[in-house]
């Protein structure tokens, strides 16, 4: 019994005069804007996006919107076309949704914020944006009160008119409309495809948060990883950083390239490599391989408990007003607008701490 290293878990609620507001990362579920896909993009990435078959032709489809089909047929006319160099990172950056177009309004603690307060971050969803990233020398924002008026409130246009037509199932096209959101510590990168939650257009979604600080014990009392990050890419250890690190190694090993959201200096995967190797390999790693990426728990981590609720937007009463305000049709407003409210429930944090049962 002397050699049993037992621990106990202590729960505590700690009142705070202020709390650091978390980083909020959001991604449009559509990866590429239809209007930004050029002839050269279509030539190189058309098959990856299931817009072309392997003979560079538009597949025989009865599902196509006439206007979109007409535009694509024009772009897919490759007679006498000289392909130019193509880079997936540049494509994601240029054709991904722009926060300046999506963000209709932004307030933090009642003060106006703007697209400039969102930092571009690449994830498996492509070009995404983080509010309050704490990077580029910007201070981490604080909040002094709980409740909706003391957090982040944004109104977004998801731009469904820009969604790529879906003529096949690929990892780069989405059946859904909306955004994916992750609320996370500034000390860890977003891992939004695995850990994010969905927010739908036509709703105002309220996310009430509670900060939880978890303190684990290292071996032999517990199983946390006390060492600093052994990584070329991340400064501090987190399960997310470890998994991204590991997924990157796995792809480089299997495909000799990396996806655009992955760190490092391996070449970016080409559209062919995405289709033939990177997408299936990463899907396999995430879904099937239980051993390659075993990431230990860090000894200290901050997570955010969340409670979500939602109401309809627009109401019948406000539909005409919003349509006029944003110079869109009522139908457009109903299909594209969402409001997201993220706030602390109360100004305290919860500590969940493993302690040695006896010294």
């Amino acid at each position: 019994y002397y050699f049993c290293y037992h621990h106990v878990t202590k729960l505590d609620e700690v009142a705070a005069s202020q709390l650091t507001f978390p980083a909020v990362t959001l991604c449009n579920l559509n990866e590429f804007r239809f209007s930004q896909v050029s002839k050269n993009d279509l030539y190189h990435a058309g098959e990856l996006l299931a817009l072309l078959n392997n003979r560079y032709e538009i597949p025989d489809t009865q599902m196509a919107d006439e206007k979109q089909l007409e535009i694509l047929q024009d772009k897919a006319n490759f007679r006498s076309f000289k392909p130019k160099p193509f880079n997936m990172r540049e494509f994601y950056d240029r054709a991904g949704h722009d926060i300046r177009d999506m963000l209709l309004s932004c307030h933090f603690r009642g003060e106006a914020c703007s697209a400039e307060d969102f930092k571009v971050v690449f994830t498996r969803y492509g070009k995404c944006y983080t509010f309050n990233s704490g990077q580029d020398g910007r201070p981490r924002l604080k909040t002094m009160k709980g409740g909706t008026g003391n957090g982040l409130e944004i109104m977004l246009d998801i731009q469904q008119d820009e969604y790529l037509p879906v003529w096949g199932e690929t990892d780069e096209t989405s059946f859904e409309a909306g955004i994916k959101v992750q609320i996370h510590s500034q000390d860890e990168p977003p891992f939004i495809d695995q850990l994010g939650f969905g927010v739908a257009p036509g709703f105002q979604t309220f996310v009430s948060c509670q900060e939880q600080r978890l303190i684990y014990l290292p071996s032999p009392w517990g199983t946390c990883n006390a060492v600093t990050m052994d990584s070329d890419f991340f400064d501090s250890y987190s399960i997310t950083a470890c998994r991204i690190d590991c997924e990157t190694r796995y792809l480089v090993e299997n495909c000799n390239c990396r996806m655009v959201h992955m760190p490092g200096d391996a070449p970016y995967c080409t559209p062919e490599q995405y289709k033939e190797c990177a997408d299936p390999a990463l899907d396999f790693l995430v879904e099937k391989d239980q051993e390659y990426c075993v990431c230990e728990m860090p000894c200290n981590l901050t997570r955010y408990g969340k409670e979500l609720s939602m109401v309809k937007i627009p109401s019948k009463a406000s539909a005409k007003y919003l349509a006029k305000k944003f110079n869109k049709s009522e139908q457009y407003i109903g299909e594209n607008i969402l409001v997201l409210d993220i706030f602390f429930e109360v100004l305290n944090y919860e500590t969940i701490e493993q302690k040695k049962a006896y010294e």
Partner: antibody, heavy 116, light 107 residues
Framework: EVQLLASGGGLVQPGGSLRLSCAAS????????MSWVRQAPGKGLEWVSG????????YYADSVKGRFTISRDNSKNTLYLQMNSLRAEDTAAYYC?????????WGQGIRVTVSS | DIQMTQSPSTLSASVGDRVTITCRAS??????LAWYQQKPGKAPKLLIY???NLESGVPSRFSGSGSGTEFTLTISSLQPDDFATYYC?????????FGQGTKLEIK
């Protein structure tokens, strides 16, 4: 080039034992699960056994459970299949394969004949 | 264990024909299905992985589709070299299982 080279087949009497080996090259062997697949003369393909990259987890088809043991030596980049209590119905060509998002490559196939 | 049912067992066709082989899983295997071609005395050759991905070097007349429990392998225009036995395999979960095979022969 990613390659698998199997060896160790032959003729053995019913109730006897045999150990198959599969030497891997061209990839980080310890990162990948591996499997053995067999094919009896004139019959279809049958998965026999699988092992995780570290060797911690092993899996078997019901037809060989308790008689066959899969193992690996990551320092030697080699996969093994220890076959005990062999039966006539174990007569087959045995293939090793690298598991991943696609099972590629496969070894060349080793003939095992169980006959008195 | 997941059962894989392949049909037909034998298929007679002519050069130039379009042929389809189907594979049905007894429970959902997502898209973790592969198709192999095998000729007598040879190791199986991978054609399609993850239900619809064409293996490098395999002619584009081969294509795969499906997800969940229903899958198909299509050869758009049969060539003399395509007469062989074809197997589907699920690699969604242990025990991994193969279909019983489809022998494609000259009509």
């Amino acid at each position: 080039e990613v390659q698998l080279l199997a060896s160790g087949g032959g003729l053995v009497q019913p109730g006897g034992s045999l150990r198959l080996s599969c030497a891997a090259s061209g990839f980080t062997f310890s990162s990948f699960a591996m499997s053995w697949v067999r094919q009896a003369p004139g019959k279809g393909l049958e998965w026999v056994s699988g092992i995780s990259g570290s060797g911690v987890s092993t899996y078997y088809a019901d037809s060989v459970k308790g008689r066959f043991t899969i193992s690996r030596d990551n320092s030697k980049n080699t996969l093994y299949l220890q076959m005990n209590s062999l039966r006539a119905e174990d007569t087959a060509a045995y293939y090793c394969a690298k598991e991943a998002y696609k099972w590629q490559p496969w070894g060349q196939g080793i003939r095992v004949t169980v006959s008195s | 264990d997941i059962q894989m049912t392949q049909s037909p067992s034998t298929l007679s066709a002519s050069v130039g024909d379009r042929v389809t082989i189907t594979c049905r899983a007894s429970q959902s295997i997502s898209s973790w299905l592969a198709w192999y071609q095998q000729k007598p005395g040879k190791a199986p050759k991978l054609l399609i992985y993850k239900a619809s991905n064409l293996e490098s070097g395999v002619p584009s007349r081969f294509s795969g589709s499906g997800s969940g429990t229903e899958f198909t392998l299509t050869i758009s225009s049969l060539q003399p070299d395509d007469f062989a036995t074809y197997y589907c395999q699920q690699y969604n979960s242990y025990s991994y299982t193969f279909g019983q095979g489809t022998k494609l022969e000259i009509k």
